[in-house]
Interface confidence: low
């Protein structure tokens, strides 16, 4: 922003009525009147070029400083060419001196040179030669000087002539202010420019109506330079929630629009599944049956919980069940769907039911699942299980209803035993097995069936209550097919897979563990 000038003294505008003091009185400087463009203009002039040793002073009236710290002095003047006078006027000069003096009171006609301090020698850029003067084409010079810092109540300026032919047409004294400014939705007051040449004064701004400093943001500040210009803007204000920037002001959002926080963005149209908003809305209310999760941005459409998983299957495999389902047909308008699986077991004899979370094992944690399948193991034989798969999204917690699908499965067999070869010799095989602990109480005995590989006509059976057996009287260096099956009071359980175990050859010795 351009600096603002506050004028303290304007000779040209005063119409010759300022009555400046000349010294020596009646000599040297003289107030003259001329007509220019049919208007009277006044000037102080002096032209004692032939006399030598001139010391003519012109002092302004006392000027009240007010709030000025640094003043600027603009002079408009003409200077005649010394060569345009007879013999070149050896004592002729083409410059004059500018002085100032500060004081707390007006000394009136009491003029003392010693109180004045020289500001500068004023030299013209262009001098008026004889031909110009005769044709009334005078060359007007403009020079500007500044003084500061000023501290007293007022000051005088003085012009010392040392033998030039000078006409002083304009003396304008002013100081500079950084003007009142609206920038970045902040108001900066009119500020007096400082006195130190490169100084910058920090000025705090005030946010306009309905504007605020954003959280963690910088307060608006500008720097007022000595020449009355603002620079180095810091920070800003933003229109508060419910308002948007229109030129240099904050205006309420129109009906059907909203703005949820202080930001540079404009008001946004209310999203889908919302009710029309009133003027100045910070958010748009959701339609009945639609919701906004706490973490949802206000610009996101309102959403609802999903429908149930579309299709659910439970496939039993011994004492395991694989659950598979497909995503809900209606996601509720969200992408953050997760699934939860719960389990209930029922005893066929009594029809009594209860939760079975503690006794079964899931292939992954059953809550917050993102995949659409899970395997449940460690199920007990001859038990009825009901599995529930619930679909949830970010707004499911805002309603009491649940979206789920169930599937039931009966476990009629124990899980197949897991069989290991513990040791072998030329004539024996030591075999062990295991089944999940929940099923062990239902097993009456284990049946071990074995036969030579390739011999389908005969096979041998051994029964035991334990978890291992040694099969004796076997042929050396021979492969046997071995299977273990649990026997329950209800009948046979699931058989293990058939294993191939080989006895040692006669060259080997001892009962070597595998």
């Amino acid at each position: 922003a351009q600096g603002k000038e506050v004028v303290l003294l304007d000779f040209a505008a005063a119409g010759g009525e300022l009555g400046w003091l000349t010294h020596p009185y009646g000599k040297g400087w003289d107030l003259m009147q001329n007509i220019m463009n049919d208007m009277p203009i006044y000037m102080y002039s002096v032209c004692n070029v032939m006399s030598g040793d001139q010391d003519n002073w012109l002092r302004t009236n006392w000027v009240y400083r007010g709030e000025a710290e640094r003043i600027f002095i603009e002079l408009k003047f003409t200077v005649r060419d010394c060569n345009s006078f007879p013999g070149g006027a050896s004592s002729c000069k083409e410059t004059f001196n500018l002085y100032y003096a500060e004081s707390d009171l007006d000394y009136g006609t009491n003029f003392q040179k010693r109180l004045f301090t020289k500001i500068d020698t004023i030299a013209p850029d262009e001098i008026t030669v004889s031909s110009d003067f005769e044709a009334r084409h005078v060359k007007l010079n403009v020079e500007e000087r500044s003084v500061g810092p000023l501290t007293r109540k007022g000051f005088y300026l003085a012009f010392q002539d040392i033998g030039a032919c000078v006409a002083l047409l304009s003396v304008r004294v002013y100081y500079k202010k950084c003007p009142e400014l609206l920038q970045g939705l902040a108001h900066f007051p009119e500020t007096i420019a400082g006195s130190d040449a490169p100084s910058l004064a920090t000025v705090a701004g005030t946010c306009v109506d309905h504007a605020v400093v954003p959280p963690g943001g910088e307060e608006p500040r500008m720097h007022c330079a000595v020449d009355g210009e603002w620079l180095v803007p810091i920070g800003q204000c933003l229109c508060q929630a419910g308002y948007e920037k229109v030129e240099d002001a904050c205006q309420a959002c129109s009906p059907g629009f909203f703005k949820f926080e202080a930001s540079e963005s404009p008001c946004l149209e209310c999203p889908e599944h919302t009710l029309p908003s009133p003027e100045g809305a910070t958010s748009c209310e959701c339609e009945e049956g639609f919701f906004r999760a706490p973490q949802d941005p206000a610009s996101m459409p309102c959403t609802r919980p999903p429908s149930a998983p579309h299709y659910l299957t439970a496939v039993g495999m011994g004492a395991k069940v694989e659950l598979r389902w497909t995503p809900p047909q209606d996601s509720g308008g969200r992408e953050d769907i997760v699934y939860s699986v719960t389990c209930e077991q029922c005893w066929p004899e009594s029809g009594e039911c209860g939760p079975c979370e503690a006794s079964v094992r899931y292939s992954e944690p059953p809550h917050g699942l993102t995949r659409t399948s899970v395997t449940v193991s460690d199920l007990e034989p001859h038990m009825n299980y009901t599995f529930t798969v619930e679909a949830r999204n970010g707004v499911s917690g805002l309603v009491t209803s649940r979206s789920f699908r169930t599937a039931s499965v009966s476990i009629n067999q124990t899980e197949p035993p897991k069989v290991r070869l513990e040791g072998r010799s030329t004539t024996s095989l030591s075999v062990s097995w295991s089944i999940p602990p929940p099923q062990q109480s239902r097993v009456w005995k284990y049946e071990v069936t074995y036969r030579k590989k390739g011999d389908s006509n005969s096979y041998n059976v051994r029964r035991t209550e334990g978890f291992s057996v040694t099969l004796d009287d076997l042929a050396p260096d021979t492969t046997y097919l071995v299977q273990v099956q649990a026997l329950t009071q209800e009948g046979q359980g699931a058989g293990s897979k058939v294993h191939e175990f080989q006895t040692l050859s006669p060259e080997g010795s001892g009962n070597l563990a595998v």
Partner: antibody, heavy 115, light 107 residues
């Protein structure tokens, strides 16, 4: 006349801290914005930050924000630069300067960050 | 951030020559631009601010010009004491940035 005298430089290991001081005289310290500028060996000048006359506002370049802190004690005519988490690239002569556009400078103090 | 590109990086001149150093800003910086002189082993010295304003006490053979993005430091009738590094600075908004510097040698 305006005088600025920096101190507190020296050798410090990477990750270490250092506090530079600048003693001011010859002018009304409390009326002036003050700045720090550094110059790595054989390199250009780099602005390190500025603090307003009363210490209300501080400004930093992104390169040192969060690591360097400028403060001042107007009663002591002193300006400070607290430098934390120093890196090898912070090796430089550090100057304090009057004004935000550095009208007067001190002679500088050398900070060497090396293991 | 606004960058300043200073050129040339070095130059050699004879006493009495007229020397020109330029500084180009990557964006308009109005006239918030200054020039500094730095002699070996010394602190920098402000010569010119607001593109063309000479600091008190700086010889008037130094002058600055420019506006917007292009700025020039001119040294008329260069003297041997002017051998130094010269840096430009933009200061319209934080962060302030300096030019890379120009080394001026006297033959």
């Amino acid at each position: 006349q305006v005088q600025l005298l920096e101190s507190g430089g020296g050798l410090v290991q990477p990750g270490g801290s250092l506090r530079l001081s600048c003693a001011a005289s010859g002018f009304t310290f409390s009326s002036y914005t003050m700045s720090w500028v550094r110059q790595a060996p054989g390199q250009a000048l780099e602005w390190m930050g500025t603090i307003s006359s009363r210490g209300t506002y501080t400004y930093y370049p992104d390169s040192v924000k969060g690591r360097f802190t400028i403060s001042r004690d107007n009663a002591k005519n002193s300006l400070y630069l607290q430098m934390n988490s120093l890196r090898a690239e912070d090796t430089a002569v550090y100057y304090c300067a009057r004004e935000a556009i550095f009208t007067h400078w001190g002679r500088g103090t050398l900070v060497t960050v090396s293991s | 951030d606004i960058q300043l590109t200073q050129s040339p990086s070095s130059l050699s001149a004879s006493v009495g020559d007229r020397v020109t150093i330029t500084c180009k800003a990557s964006q308009d910086i109005n006239n918030y631009h200054s020039w500094y002189q730095q002699k070996p082993g010394q602190a920098p010295r402000l010569l010119i601010y607001r593109a063309n304003r000479l600091v008190d006490g700086v010889p008037d053979r130094f002058s600055g010009s420019g506006y917007g993005t292009d700025f020039t430091l001119t040294i008329n009738n260069i003297e041997s004491e002017d051998a130094a590094y010269y840096f430009c600075l933009k200061y319209n908004v934080f962060p302030y940035t300096f030019g890379q510097g120009t080394k001026v040698e006297i033959k």
